[in-house]
């Protein structure tokens, strides 16, 4: 998948399995990740558990776990709030669109977290104090999580290597470095840039991510995907002149 | 080996103010530089771990990023602590210890808060 | 919990090889360089040699080098030490430890060489 | 490469005694940024190390308050403030500071 890290930095990811997304001492999160197509290195997410631990008089700990096709509106015993602690409303599950868009708010941490079905995968996105991000008392064990660290780099795709090669050959495959099998031959590199632009007009890192996922995987979806996640950047960043990250010159050979 | 504490450093002395254009670049530069240093001296304890060949890269990356120098001014982390999570002795009435923004208003005029996203392929 | 198991320790005889096994868990264990100590009977404690995280980069102690050979596969959670050429002086308890610097041990796993 | 000599090599102490064992490095292990990387491990009788101390005086996670690290350059102490029965085993200094790592040849702690 695709980060955006609470440093702004912007990596594709090849990781697979599970992996930490987030692991403080209020909060834990994991993903799980699966290849797109049999035998691709790119992979999306098919699992999301995030952990609220117990904190004081406000929320017991709680678990929500979302699956593909099974984006639940509560915690898995049911509830959707903090439990029966004095300040349990201080945790709190909303269902925006049901089966696709569920937003959770936890306020004693100053944190919302946004949870999308998109296709077939999820999509995850999240807006935290600096000292929550950093509320970390074994840096050893929990330190190494990707929404801090990102990915390791033997883990990275660099899709806008991928990107420029398409958008200067006209390929829709890169023959050395492809992180995936040829996906549907119907899916030129003109179409693919026609459909992104359609729903990102600006020509950042979200739209060369969206181009990238549809010459992998030839699913349309994969622009939604896009799509929502800057909306809800959009919604949770709170430097809005960094909404759009832009690529960087120097990755880019053959480019002013 | 403590690399991951550099990172923590680094990451609360800039937080909110490393945009490549911005006008804090000379600050973030020497957060950079501070972060740098406190890499090289991990590096005999963690030289053969993940977490310090992630941190020399990415330092390596937004060097070059920002045009920042290799030697010039450091700086020093900025920290604030935050109540300590699990349960509390204390049993407390009020529910603004449940509502962080209340009770970082005491302390601070306006927490930073950031943002982490993961999507499509 | 951090667990480090060694296997494959044994008799052999001098000039024979030997293939011993740690296998890791309760850790990420490709996230961090290993590792190979070992301690003569009744004697003190002597670096073998370490791995990193990634295998790029090994290190041995000069009373091994080009006999040894470290190796390990993150997939299995599993580090190796190879033996060959192996000499009476070799005879000691095997410990594989976690971290460039070693934190976490296992338990030891015994190598005899005699004829 | 460099040697660690520790002394004594047999240490009986009394219980609820303090004990001190010294390490001498044969050269300096402090960095030219100032750090020192020496650590202490314990070897209870029939058990695998344990690392005690970390960087000459940080105590490792789990490991009891009356054990303490001192020193710098080459004079190094562990030093335990009342000694216990499970206490008993070898403790040795280990240097990351120049390569190869190198051990100290063990000090035996033992009961009088």
């Known amino acids: 998948p695709h980060l955006r890290t609470f440093t702004d930095r912007f990596q594709t990811c090849k990781v697979q399995g599970a992996w930490p997304l987030i692991d403080n001492n209020y909060l834990n999160v994991q993903v799980t990740n699966t290849p797109v197509l049999p035998g691709s290195a790119a992979t999306a997410t098919s699992k999301l558990t995030i952990i609220f631990k117990n904190f004081q008089e406000c929320v017991d700990q709680k678990v929500y776990q979302a699956e593909m096709d099974e984006l639940p509106a509560a915690f898995v015993d049911g509830s959707k709030n903090g439990g029966d602690k004095h300040g349990a409303n201080s945790l709190k599950i909303t269902e925006k669109v049901s089966g696709q868009h569920v937003e959770i708010q936890a306020k004693y941490i100053g944190t919302t977290i946004v949870v999308r079905q998109v296709g077939r995968y999820l999509t995850f996105a999240v807006r935290m104090p600096e000292e929550v991000v950093n509320a970390v008392e074994d840096w050893d064990s929990q330190g190494l999580y990707l929404c801090l660290r990102g990915c390791p780099l033997n883990q990275q795709i660099d899709f806008q290597a991928f990107h420029t090669n398409a958008e200067g050959t006209g390929a829709r495959r890169l023959a050395a470095a492809s992180p995936a099998p040829t996906a549907p031959e119907t899916f030129p590199y003109e179409t693919a840039v026609a459909k992104c632009k359609e729903k990102l007009p600006v020509e950042d890192l979200y739209y060369q991510a969206c181009v990238f996922d549809l010459l992998t995987t030839g699913d349309v979806n994969f622009t939604l995907a896009a799509y929502y996640a800057l909306e809800d950047v959009k919604m949770l960043h709170s430097n809005k002149d960094k909404l759009h990250l832009y690529e960087r010159t120097r990755d880019l050979p053959g480019r002013a | 080996c403590k690399i991951l504490k550099c990172n923590s450093e680094f990451w609360s002395a800039t937080s909110g103010s490393h945009a490549p254009a911005s006008d804090d670049t000379p600050e973030f530069c020497a957060a950079l530089r501070s972060y740098a240093l406190c890499t090289r001296r991990t590096a005999r304890t963690c030289r053969g771990d993940l977490a310090y060949h992630s941190a020399v890269h990415g330092i390596e990356d937004l060097m070059s990023q920002h045009n920042c120098s290799k030697d010039g001014p450091t700086s020093q982390p900025r920290l604030r602590t935050l109540p300590p999570a699990g349960d509390s002795q204390e049993r407390s009435d009020s529910p603004e210890i449940c509502h962080y923004e209340k009770s970082f208003h005491k302390h601070s005029a306006t927490p930073n808060y950031t943002h982490c996203g993961l999507f499509g392929d | 919990e951090v667990q480090l198991v060694e296997s494959g320790g044994g008799l052999v005889q001098p000039g024979g090889s030997l293939r011993l096994s740690c296998a890791a868990s309760?850790?990420?264990?490709?996230?961090?360089?290993m590792n190979w100590i070992r301690q003569a009977p009744g004697k003190g404690l002597e670096w073998i040699g370490m791995i990193y995280y990634d295998s790029s980069e090994k290190h041995y102690a000069d009373s091994v080098k080009g006999r040894f050979t470290i190796s390990r596969d993150n997939s299995k959670n599993t580090l190796y030490l190879q033996m060959n050429s192996l000499r009476a002086e070799d005879t000691a308890v095997y410990y594989c430890?976690?971290?460039?610097?070693?934190?976490?041990w296992g338990q030891g796993t015994m190598v005899t060489v005699s004829s | 490469d460099v040697v660690l000599t520790q002394s004594p090599l047999s240490l009986p102490v009394t219980l609820g005694q303090p004990a001190s064992i010294s390490c001498r490095s044969s050269q300096s292990l402090e960095t030219s940024d100032g750090d020192t990387f020496l650590e202490w491990f314990q070897q209870r009788p029939g058990q695998s190390p344990r690392l005690l101390i970390y960087e000459v005086s940080n105590r490792f996670s789990g490991v009891p308050d009356r054990f303490s690290g001192s020193g710098s350059g080459t004079d190094f102490t562990l030093k335990i403030s009342r000694v216990e029965a499970e206490d008993v085993g070898v403790y040795y200094c280990f240097q990351v500071t120049h390569d190869p790592v190198t051990f100290g040849q063990g000090t035996k702690l033992e009961i009088k």
């Open positions: 309760g850790f990420t264990f490709s996230n961090y360089g």
């Open positions: 430890a976690k971290g460039t610097t070693p934190d976490y």
